[in-house]
Interface confidence: low
């Protein structure tokens, strides 16, 4: 799903207040709900009729450092006999997410939000067929 | 997929540098790759064999203010005849994502990262069957 543009209003102070100096703002350390965890069914990437593989990307100057991307294994979907049926399509499900990028020069460290497109998994869909009349 | 704990190291300065004052850090305004967009197939939530609905939650003190959650429509999956097949399961695909929480008292505005669990869509899986021994 889409993350709307910031429009530079969310991070601004109310109009009656002095502006934020130097184009930066104060970010409190610590993460709200840090212990919250995904509780997905196990091995759904293998058990799905539109199975997928995972690739892990690692960047020490990004939080989270590990970002996992899914890739659909097949064009079609897996039928009850375990065979690929290309009358159906395995398609990726994507999500826009935020990460934090760390930038440092010596002892001067600053952070910036970054939007990342993550493929979370795959789903099996019926292709839309349009015939020219 | 899981976002690991911060461990309070990512947001710290190198050990040889003076500590960050007041438990906060500098976050630059603006978002890297802000124009990046999801390019998912159209209407996959309706065309999927494990279809889902979307619910939008809105919070003006969160960025992004709009967070969209998916809910699987069925317990089973939709077969070629358009009927629900409960020998298969529709299961949610979840993703941990970061949002920014805005906190303000008068002209003092600060921000904090928050972890949110988002259900992005659903996929059709073969159920894990446990036999009683």
């Amino acid at each position: 799903r889409k993350i709307p543009k910031v429009g530079h209003t969310f991070f601004q102070k109310p109009e009656s207040c002095p502006p934020v100096p130097g184009g930066s703002m104060k970010l409190d350390i610590g993460i709200i709900n840090e212990n919250q965890r995904v509780s997905m069914s196990r091995n759904i990437e293998s058990r799905s009729t539109s199975p997928w593989n995972y690739t892990v990307t690692w960047d020490p100057n990004r939080y989270p450092s590990e970002v996992v991307q899914a890739q659909c294994r097949n064009l079609g979907c897996i039928n009850a006999q375990g065979k690929e049926d290309i009358s159906m399509n395995s398609v990726p499900i994507q999500q826009e997410t935020l990460v934090v990028r760390r930038k440092h020069q010596g002892c001067s460290v600053s952070f910036q939000l970054e939007k990342v497109l993550v493929t979370v998994g795959c789903t099996c869909v019926t292709p839309v067929i349009h015939h020219v009349q | 997929r899981k976002i690991p704990k911060v461990g309070h190291t990512f947001f710290q300065k190198p050990e040889s540098c003076p500590p960050v004052p007041g438990g906060s850090m500098k976050l630059d305004i603006g978002i890297i790759n802000e124009n990046q967009r999801v390019s998912m197939s159209r209407n996959i939530e309706s065309r999927s064999t494990s279809p889902w609905n979307y619910t939008v939650t809105w919070d003006p003190n969160r960025y992004p203010s709009e967070v969209v959650q998916a809910q699987c429509r069925n317990l089973g999956c939709i077969n070629a005849q358009g009927k629900e097949d409960i020998s298969m399961n529709s299961v949610p695909i979840q993703q941990e994502t970061l949002v920014v929480r805005r906190k303000h008292q008068g002209c003092s505005v600060s921000f904090q990262l928050e972890k949110v669990l988002v259900t992005v869509g659903c996929t059709c899986v073969t159920p894990v069957i446990h036999h009683v021994q």
Partner: antibody
Framework: QVQLVQSGGGLVQPGRSLRLSCAAS????????MHWVRQAPGKGLEWVSG????????GYADSVKGRFTISRDNAKNSLYLQMNSLRAEDTALYYC??????????????????WGQGTTVTVSS | EIVLTQSPGTLSLSPGERATLSCRAS???????LAWYQQKPGQAPRLLIY???SRATGIPDRFSGSGSGTDFTLTISRLEPEDFAVYYC???????FGGGTKVEIK
Amino acid sequence: QVQLVQSGGGLVQPGRSLRLSCAASGFTFDDYAMHWVRQAPGKGLEWVSGISWNSGTIGYADSVKGRFTISRDNAKNSLYLQMNSLRAEDTALYYCAKELYISDWDSYSYGMDVWGQGTTVTVSS
Amino acid sequence: EIVLTQSPGTLSLSPGERATLSCRASQSVSSSYLAWYQQKPGQAPRLLIYGASSRATGIPDRFSGSGSGTDFTLTISRLEPEDFAVYYCQQYGSSPFGGGTKVEIK
């Protein structure tokens, strides 16, 4: 009516480049994958390249991989084929064609229901 | 990759006769994704059949497609003068077209 109008063919020396264009009208261009198919003189049809509706997936025949680039501009309802390092064996009549099915990320074809008029590419010194 | 082989290379028949064209795949092909085209000299190909057996819009009912797995057939029940042309089968994939069958007037 539904149509594809091609331009950009001609005579070119081996090793040089050429760009083919295909202008679509009469259908929702950005719903469909599009293809380039060629036919050497007196020979059969050969699929050259295909591109999904959102340019997310692109496919090429082995014979043109690394030399040809397919692209599309949905805002202009146009399909392109950039041909570099041309060889004598690329001499052919080139057709653009519309995919029959709306598919999700395909660059291969299930069937092509609308074809351009064809444009001739001759590679010769 | 799957290779499509069409036979015969040339079919010599008279108007009014029945034409049977064969397309054989080197491996099983989903019948959902086999198509047939007609091409006349100096013209672009024209889609006749998709999904192995469905007629494209505007195609006369004397044209029919059948088959599954590795063997597919295009049948023209009664040849009309305008049917003399080259016919190609096509499958989903990176090398999709067969070599063609020419139907000529005997």
